[in-house]
């Protein structure tokens, strides 16, 4: 084993290095001292370190470690943050296009239903946006609300134009009739199925990306324990106490220390792997009715078909509803 | 018969269904993200090694510091003997993860469970029992998956997927529809966001 080089007789080198860490030289001994009060850099002979210096080294070591950890995760963090933002924005754009397509369909095919239809469509797509972002909204309720709102307007404007402008009273009866008589056939149920499946998947996808950011942020800002700080100090700085300024830690030693310091963090590994593989599985299944882009941009067409379906059955419906909502209608005609 | 929404924009910019060779749709963007994420699948297990390779460490054939003294080769046993008066590496590992790490592990377990529940098994088909009583059946084909675009009559079955990058530059505005308060014109930054995605690694 090679003999250690003789320590700097004046601690001059140590002082000039330490000055960069901590301006003001009062903590560095003029000449090597016994260092009996040291707790981390236990000396085998005289040392150029004091207890105060050791504390500063520990603080610096932990800060270094935090910076290294942050730079390690920077690329991954940027990848997920940027994609989460891009997808959220893209989904909002899809929702906006879907809303515009649907409004355009009403304008072209059913001008008499506008502008009320625009408001109902607006409410529906507002709720779609909020659902994707994690709000506690029930998709079936959203779809029911859309058809419940549309039917009174369809009834009074398309099927029974002689009726005065619908009031809340008759509207409520018509809303009830809409469900009881399955006025739109199976279209509401079909839309519920497609919209709920595609939005659920979209929502969980965004939630997963946001959790990914949270995972990285958590490990990015970990505060390392005192024990870890001591190990890092011993690895990076204790050599300085002996005047060995240019010496680097052994590779194997570094790995052991890092595994010790990161034992807790490394426990995430198993769940992180599973997270990426599960996300991949989800993404592979995001097509057809599990793809919100596909579903929402086709909604205008399904809604159009549902209104045609009502018109096809208008005769039968008007008679039935005439009896069912007679009471409300009489009150309105008065 | 219904119309394609594009008919609306004849007077404005017609929405061309551009067949861009490398057009980036949402689904291609998702797959690209997964591929990039998979390159980070060993991120946490590789962290100790990564940090050592990015901090000053001696080359194999040079003298190095083992926490006690200068040595030619690192021996874990020797280093451990030197450390035993201080703190035990094994104890440090036994302490278990920080509370914040345990918390995030719980969240990961939860999302993984959700992701597995939501993942679509290959070949899963929608329930076929959508045709219940009503005035008439819902006018849809055999495979409900294909029923997104509604019935025939020149109506498209499924709207061509929004071109993730290409189409965003088009004006899909329905602002001229009275009562439609929503601004539909893509904001400048929407367009630039998507055009500047580049290859994020």
């Amino acid at each position: 084993q090679p003999p250690p080089p003789p320590p700097d007789a004046t601690c001059h080198q140590v002082r000039s290095f330490f000055q960069r860490l901590q301006p003001g030289l009062k903590w560095v001994p003029e000449t090597p001292v016994p260092g009996s009060d040291l707790q981390v850099c236990l000396p085998k002979g005289p040392t150029c370190c004091s207890r105060k210096m050791e504390e500063k080294y520990q603080l610096t070591a932990r800060l270094n470690m935090e910076q290294l950890l942050q730079s390690a995760s920077m690329e991954l963090k940027f990848l997920i943050i940027q994609n989460a933002a891009v997808f959220q924005e893209a989904f909002e754009i899809v929702v906006r296009h879907a809303k515009n397509y649907t409004n355009a369909m009403f304008k072209n095919n059913y001008p008499s239903l506008t502008p009320q239809a625009f408001e109902f469509v607006g409410e529906f797509f507002t709720d779609v946006s909020l659902y994707i972002l994690g709000s506690d909204i029930n998709v079936d309720d959203m779809v029911n609300e859309l058809f419940d709102s549309l039917f009174p307007v369809i009834y009074t404007q398309l099927m029974n134009p002689g009726l005065p402008d619908s009031a809340l009273d008759i509207n409520e009866c018509l809303r009830g009739a809409r469900r009881d008589l399955k006025v739109f056939g199976n279209f509401p149920k079909l839309i519920m199925t497609q919209v709920s499946k595609s939005l659920q998947v979209t929502r969980i996808f965004l939630q997963a990306l946001n959790l990914g950011i949270e995972v990285i942020n958590t490990t990015d800002h970990l505060k390392f324990s005192k024990d870890c700080g001591r190990m890092l100090t011993r690895m990076w700085y204790c050599s300085y106490c002996q005047g060995l300024m240019m010496v680097k830690p052994c590779g194997g030693y570094c790995n052991v220390v890092m595994q010790g310091c990161m034992a807790g963090v490394v426990e995430i590994d198993k769940y992180w792997r599973e997270y990426i593989l599960s996300l991949e599985e989800l993404v592979n299944g995001m097509y057809r009715i599990y793809d919100m882009e596909n579903v929402l941009l086709g909604l205008f067409s399904t809604i159009h078909d549902s209104i045609q379906y009502v018109q096809k059955n208008a005769g039968k419906l008007t008679t039935t509803i005439g009896k069912l909502c007679a009471h409300s209608q009489q009150r309105q005609y008065r | 018969s219904a119309y394609y929404p594009e008919d609306l924009f004849i007077d404005k910019k017609v929405l061309k269904v551009a067949h861009v060779e490398h057009e980036e749709t949402l689904s291609s963007r998702r797959r690209e993200l997964i591929q990039k994420l998979k390159s980070f699948i060993s991120f946490y297990s590789a962290l100790p090694g990564y940090i050592c390779s990015h901090s000053p460490v001696a080359e194999n054939d040079t003298l190095c510091w083992n926490g006690q003294e200068l040595v030619e080769r690192y021996s874990q046993k020797a280093a451990r003997n030197g450390m035993k008066n201080q703190f035990n590496l094994h104890e440090l590992k036994m302490k278990g993860p920080e509370p914040v790490v345990s918390q995030i592990i719980d969240k990961l377990k939860h999302i993984n469970q959700l992701l597995r529940t939501m993942s679509v098994p290959k070949g899963r088909v929608l329930d076929k029992n959508l045709d219940e009583e009503g005035f008439e059946s819902g006018d849809c084909g055999d495979d409900e998956d294909e029923c997104i675009g509604g019935s025939g009559d020149g109506m498209m079955k499924v709207k061509n997927q929004l071109r993730f990058l290409a189409e965003l530059a088009y004006d899909l505005d329905v602002d001229d529809v009275p009562g439609n308060n929503q601004q539909a014109t893509p904001k400048d930054n929407e367009i630039s966001t998507f055009h500047n995605l580049g290859n994020v690694h």
Epitope: Q116, E123, T126, L133, S135, D136, E172, G176 | N181, Q182
Partner: antibody, heavy 116, light 102 residues
């Protein structure tokens, strides 16, 4: 914390236009799911909803007053403005603005102090 | 004439349970919110989405909603609970308040 404050003239002549400003803090009208609504209450009477504006600039109006009302927002100033044309003595009331959580079925969870 | 019907007034002895109703055709399918308004003050949300209580609202306030009636219940009513109470629901694109119960 969330606070809202209404401001505007105390007195308006018949046929004139009333302009009310709601200045708020503690939230942003660019945040998804946020809205601001206007409600009025004639002396000794019930609350009556007037208008609601969403974060995405969607607007909803009371059908009976729709032709007279305009609601706008200035996100950078944290303000919402309501204008009501053709004022009449029956429009005498305390006018409140309120923060709305759109996702919670348009609940009004924070109210201003009101302006008479 | 409001589409949500509330009794104009209700009284209860201190410590007893007060119930205020809000009637509306099929109101059970709507989310109902309740506000308390004391003289000279702004309304305060006490129950939202039928049954949920905002933070800071005492546990004695609870709500339910089914069929054609939503109900606000104050169990163990206190003198400080004396106020006007309004129910509110969202009808498609319209916000509707009840006539209030004193």
């Amino acid at each position: 914390q969330v606070t809202l404050k209404e401001s505007g003239p105390t007195l308006v002549k018949p046929t004139q236009t009333l302009t009310l400003t709601c200045t708020f803090s503690g939230f942003s009208l660019s945040t998804s799911g946020v809205g601001v609504g206007w409600i009025r209450q004639p002396p000794g009477k019930a609350l009556e909803w007037l208008a609601l504006i969403y974060w995405n600039d969607d607007k909803r109006y009371s059908p009976s007053l729709k032709s007279r009302l305009t609601i706008t927002k200035d996100t950078s100033k944290n303000q919402v403005v309501l204008t009501m044309t053709n004022m009449d003595p029956v429009d005498t009331a305390t006018y409140y603005c309120a923060h709305s959580r759109i996702a919670a079925r348009r609940v009004l969870d924070y109210w201003g102090q009101g302006t008479l | 004439q409001s589409v949500l019907t509330q009794p104009p007034s209700a009284s209860v002895a201190p410590g007893k349970t007060a119930r205020i109703t809000c009637g509306g055709n099929n109101i059970g399918s709507k989310s109902v919110h309740w506000y308390q308004q004391k003289p000279g003050q702004s309304p305060v949300l006490v129950i939202y989405q039928d049954t949920k209580r905002p933070s800071g609202i005492p546990e004695r306030f609870s709500g339910s909603n089914s069929g054609n009636t939503a109900t606000l219940t104050i169990s163990g009513a206190q003198p400080m609970d004396e106020a006007d109470y309004y129910c509110q629901a969202w009808y498609s694109t319209i916000m509707v308040f009840g006539g209030g119960t004193k």
